[in-house]
Amino acid sequence: IWELKKDVYVVELDWYPDAPGEMVVLTCDTPEEDGITWTLDQSSEVLGSGKTLTIQVKEFGDAGQYTCHKGGEVLSHSLLLLHKKEDGIWSTDILKDQKEPKNKTFLRCEAKNYSGRFTCWWLTTISTDLTFSVKSSRGSSDPQGVTCGAATLSAERVRGDNKEYEYSVECQEDSACPAAEESLPIEVMVDAVHKLKYENYTSSFFIRDIIKPDPPKNLQLKPLKNSRQVEVSWEYPDTWSTPHSYFSLTFCVQVQGKSKREKKDRVFTDKTSATVICRKNASISVRAQDRYYSSSWSEWASVPCS
Amino acid sequence: RNLPVATPDPGMFPCLHHSQNLLRAVSNMLQKARQTLEFYPCTSEEIDHEDITKDKTSTVEACLPLELTKNESCLNSRETSFITNGSCLASRKTSFMMALCLSSIYEDLKMYQVEFKTMNAKLLMDPKRQIFLDQNMLAVIDELMQALNFNSETVPQKSSLEEPDFYKTKIKLCILLHAFRIRAVTIDRVMSYLNAS
């Protein structure tokens, strides 16, 4: 058993049918010695008396808010949560496996640049009685500071019969140098509590591996005289690290017909312009990627050919 | 400790092309190592990230773009002295700081070159003959060093009398390649910045 926060405790259980569970001793936080009784949640049934209460915690029915009273007055509370270990592996019931980029990916994180700011998000089908708390650091043995905000519900989607809820959090490394070469990964830890179930999820990454630039901005077309060709130009996104000559991007320019089946023409360039043939009803899209370190491509920025 | 904007004339910067070749070569070699050594811990998540140049060179700090010198987090640099007469400098106006930066890059390349050559000698003794260093990568390191053209003491190739532990050697190869790729990215950024300035 360990303390998650004041008066909230996590009991770790080896989870299998007929498991013996864990013996837990609760102590009433009071100078009083006599006349103390214990109850669980809203029930008025007295579970025991005395300054300490010994319970055998086996299942969720044994978890909850234990309260010690004296003469109708509440003295203190202890909330017991359960953390299930199923055949040596901690349970992952609360969050959905996003399966990208690999199986068992519960937290996904992205950064728009090298400033040390990043966003993580996760999915669940649970809509109520759910709380998250996020901590982060650079490295784990001698951790350096990363400050995270509160996790917020950022999207709701309908997936088949189920509703899916996306939560996200923004974090910022306290002293980040954009040019630094990372040797210690960022660690992100999410505590999830659903009713009386506790779970924790972690992700470890280097900022350089989660870079996804914003799409190029100010995408414009300039027709070339007496030609079906157009000059496409764009700019680096505002959110990208500066100076751009040091933090350079490379670009992919795509001409896509109305039908998804039509052949796509693609050009790769390090410049912020390109000359392409603009077909009728086609659109031109441009996306960006770090020129020197192949992390994710940005989303496409698009303009119609007409 | 930073790169001023007054740098060589446009088109007078032969190192950019070499640094791009270097990044391509080390990335290809790393990919080959990850595929060939699939049963070894060779992915970024599995290896320890060690920098063999730590406390010996200070490339990131010495080559910091001027715009980032206002960022205090970038300025906790270690002072290191370098020889400063390189041919990539193609302009008499080149500052001392830039020379320091390029000589730091040269020292990095020299250290990695020695490590890779020592390692290759060990890998050639492996009866499994599972993996060797790409000669192209070693040649590209050499080309960039020649383009930088710094006079520096030759570091003798390390020789070991004991029987090599091939498993450890292959894991060390992965660690070196990961670190060298990260350094090659920094070198490419620096060359791009200098070329544009």
Partner: antibody, heavy 115, light 112 residues
Framework: QVQLVQSGGGVVQPGRSLRLSCAAS????????MHWVRQAPGKGLEWVAF????????YYADSVKGRFTISRDNSKNTLYLQMKSLRAEDTAVYYC????????WGQGTMVTVSS | SYVLTQPPSVSGTPGQRVTISCSGG????????VKWYQQLPGTAPKLLIY???QRPSGVPDRFSGSKSGTSASLAITGVQAEDEADYYC????????????FGTGTKVTVLG
């Protein structure tokens, strides 16, 4: 006392369907994940499928994906394996088993796919 | 499709020490715990060892398990006639959990 009693095995022709059941007692069935494991005659153990305690997630071996469906009825304390498009290579003894560091197995039920 | 490799058979005379190996990789045994099962002819498998080296109550202490790196082993010290059975190791793969990975199985024969 934890008990898993299996039923539903038998002889079936290739291409036909069969549904196996596993009735649980002696524990809170709705709190635990469950597996199906099979063993072809004279061969080793092969995992078939898994279902979470609440039925929210199901996982299958590649060899049965798209043909077999694992399900549970927590109100009846019963686990099911619906097998469709059966093949000769599905002939085996099928076991249900609880998920956990200490597990309990059903007695097994024989499924024979033969024309 | 077995990723955990066991010797097909091992044998010993009563009282001898018999060991069975189970060889895997970094993503399975290297990252997860190992179980061992005993299966007597015509019966369901019985758990002998869980969490690499733990014995459930009721399992004789002549059975012991260990794990090192990407392989595990089961030892029977002082093998007895009633130990003649098939033995299977089981683990998980970190990418496909909760799918159970079983070893190929080992037939233990007690001679004499």
């Amino acid at each position: 006392q934890v008990q898993l009693v299996q039923s539903g095995g038998g002889v079936v022709q290739p291409g036909r369907s069969l549904r196996l059941s596993c009735a649980a007692s002696g524990f809170t069935f709705s709190s635990y994940g469950m597996h199906w494991v099979r063993q072809a005659p004279g061969k080793g153990l092969e995992w078939v499928a898994f279902i979470r305690y609440d039925g929210s997630n199901k996982y299958y071996a590649d060899s049965v994906k798209g043909r077999f469906t694992i399900s549970r009825d927590n109100s009846k304390n019963t686990l099911y394996l619906q097998m469709k498009s059966l093949r000769a290579e599905d002939t085996a003894v099928y076991y249900c088993k609880t998920h956990g560091s200490h597990d309990n197995w059903g007695q097994g039920t024989m499924v024979t796919v033969s024309s | 499709s077995y990723v955990l490799t066991q010797p097909p058979s091992v044998s010993g005379t009563p009282g001898q020490r018999v060991t069975i190996s189970c060889s895997g990789g970094r993503s399975n045994i290297g990252s997860n715990t190992v179980k061992w099962y005993q299966q007597l002819p015509g019966t369901a498998p019985k758990l002998l060892i869980y969490r690499n080296d733990q014995r459930p109550s009721g399992v004789p202490d002549r059975f012991s398990g260990s794990k090192s790196g990407t392989s595990a082993s089961l030892a029977i010290t002082g093998v007895q006639a009633e130990d003649e059975a098939d033995y299977y190791c089981q683990s998980y793969d970190r990418g496909t959990h909760p799918a159970l990975l079983f070893g190929t199985g080992t037939k233990v024969t007690v001679l004499g």
